[in-house]
Amino acid sequence: QLSRAGRSAPLAAGCPDRCEPARCPPQPEHCEGGRARDACGCCEVCGAPEGAACGLQEGPCGEGLQCVVPFGVPASATVRRRAQAGLCVCASSEPVCGSDANTYANLCQLRAASRRSERLHRPPVIVLQRGACGQGQEDPNSLRHKYNFIADVVEKIAPAVVHIELFRKLPFSKREVPVASGSGFIVSEDGLIVTNAHVVTNKHRVKVELKNGATYEAKIKDVDEKADIALIKIDHQGKLPVLLLGRSSELRPGEFVVAIGSPFSLQNTVTTGIVSTTQRGGKELGLRNSDMDYIQTDAIINYGNSGGPLVNLDGEVIGINTLKVTAGISFAIPSDKIKKFLTESHDRQAKGKAITKKKYIGIRMMSLTSSKAKELKDRHRDFPDVISGAYIIEVIPDTPAEAGGLKENDVIISINGQSVVSANDVSDVIKRESTLNMVVRRGNEDIMITVIPEEIDP
């Protein structure tokens, strides 16, 4: 038995103190308007369908419908007592998409269609989504619409995030195969892209793929191995979308950040988290030769988004995703370091001293020590009588070294009046000087040789 305490319907006149289900009249198998409770809330009856009259005489509206008097006021006990008839109107007024791929003006119409379908022994129609079929739900007042700020950031920055792929040559066939990939982001409309130095290491061919699927060959413009930042360039007609650099110095622990990358063509990977620490020393992290500070975040950084941007909620780059140390702890190179790198790179290129151009003379050499000299002398009777300098292992054909007259087994003992003790001394002078006046020990002769280094792409 039902107690009236549980009833949702307003108490109507003439209702029994206790509901007795046995006294309820039998109901038809199918109800056009769906089932509803009678005015007393005791018995299940057939509800009036949408648009049908409702009120005291006519009975209740079906499921999801409410009885509304012509003035738009929902029928109450008072209305009923006045015996004023209302109309059954759907409580929900927005369109819905049904599983039968039809759009219904409201939920009640979908329910009615579902009842008809079941009557014909077909599957019921269920709600697939709010809004018309094939149309996104764009309710500006929905929570999803109001609070998905991460998705908003991603939408804003994604076009400027690129996929980078490196290729190597097979040893004999010389066919190129992919060897590694990473991400990067565009910083200038004419195609300058920032990524990690470790992403574009060595003499690999670098291919860049944009969000729209267009692919380009990239040239390495500048690299800072220590800071792990590289600048590459693609030649693109027209303006490219760019990301702006924020101030990493103004970052606060607890700020939301988004790490985005492009590990596969035409796809982005997004992780999010907060800034844990704004300045973690590289030495602290056990990174070799790094005295740089890193941004620590719990946003997951992995091979897929390495080289991509770490952005704040304004879509400004505050770091380059760089490495994952342990689960839940990742690090990014601060944007202030990127700014410094880009400024210095611009200066170098303006002065024609970009790291892209490497000075080269075409020798392989090693530092000569007294023990190495003794060993070589034992092996070659005519080896020069020297105990330090740069010993030439190999002179590469068609290079400045060969043109200048350097030969294998020569020992460079001075360049431009400065004595040479090690191979490093030679490397340093090559970087600095445009002409190398060398004194070379060959057998037991000292020979003067002039070599003009050439500039090559690294």
Partner: antibody, heavy 123, light 105 residues
Framework: QVQLVQSGAEVKKPGASVKVSCKAS????????MHWVRQAPGQRLEWMGA????????AYNQKFKGRVTITADKSASTAYMELSSLRSEDTAVYYC????????????????WGQGTLVTVSS | DIQMTQSPSSLSASVGDRVTITCSVS?????MYWYQQKPGKAPKLLIY???NLASGVPSRFSGSGSGTDFTFTISSLQPEDIATYYC????????FGQGTKLEIK
Amino acid sequence: QVQLVQSGAEVKKPGASVKVSCKASGYTFTDYEMHWVRQAPGQRLEWMGAIDPETGGTAYNQKFKGRVTITADKSASTAYMELSSLRSEDTAVYYCTREGYSYEGGGYYFDYWGQGTLVTVSS
Amino acid sequence: DIQMTQSPSSLSASVGDRVTITCSVSSSVSYMYWYQQKPGKAPKLLIYDTSNLASGVPSRFSGSGSGTDFTFTISSLQPEDIATYYCQQWTSYPTFGQGTKLEIK
């Protein structure tokens, strides 16, 4: 994980030919060259040749040129080495080995090897 | 052709000893590679690019050198290190040293 599984031992008569197979798994077969290296009893390892499984392009050690043929079946991820006009000094263990590549230095080496196939040439 | 000379061809050492093997090439090479081969087994890469340890190889193994002279070292010999060791270069095509057979005293 990367695995190279070779066919079983063979006994051949002088003048005959032998064909050894090498089934690769655990990596993209066409992204690496497959090489063949042999080792005669008490001798050093000796490189015979290589194939690019994608294109079928080959390279051979001059010493074996004309006697060795390396082929590959992409669909089966299998490489083959056939040595003809066998002589007693071809008695050796024949290995297939994948070309490895150093991302840092750009150097080449052999990173994975088959278990070896003993070919005995005897009359 | 590049000639490779590995020395010694065999050596006997005690557990815990420091063991050094050298490899000389007839003309300069960029890198040297070192392999370990146990009886009845295929060679196993230990050192790549002259001095880099291959994945899963114990740190007691190391390599050094440049140009024409290269060295392979086991800092503290262990019983499981008994094997033959080969050096390998790859300039125009791969060639191997004749091997060094290492035994326990």
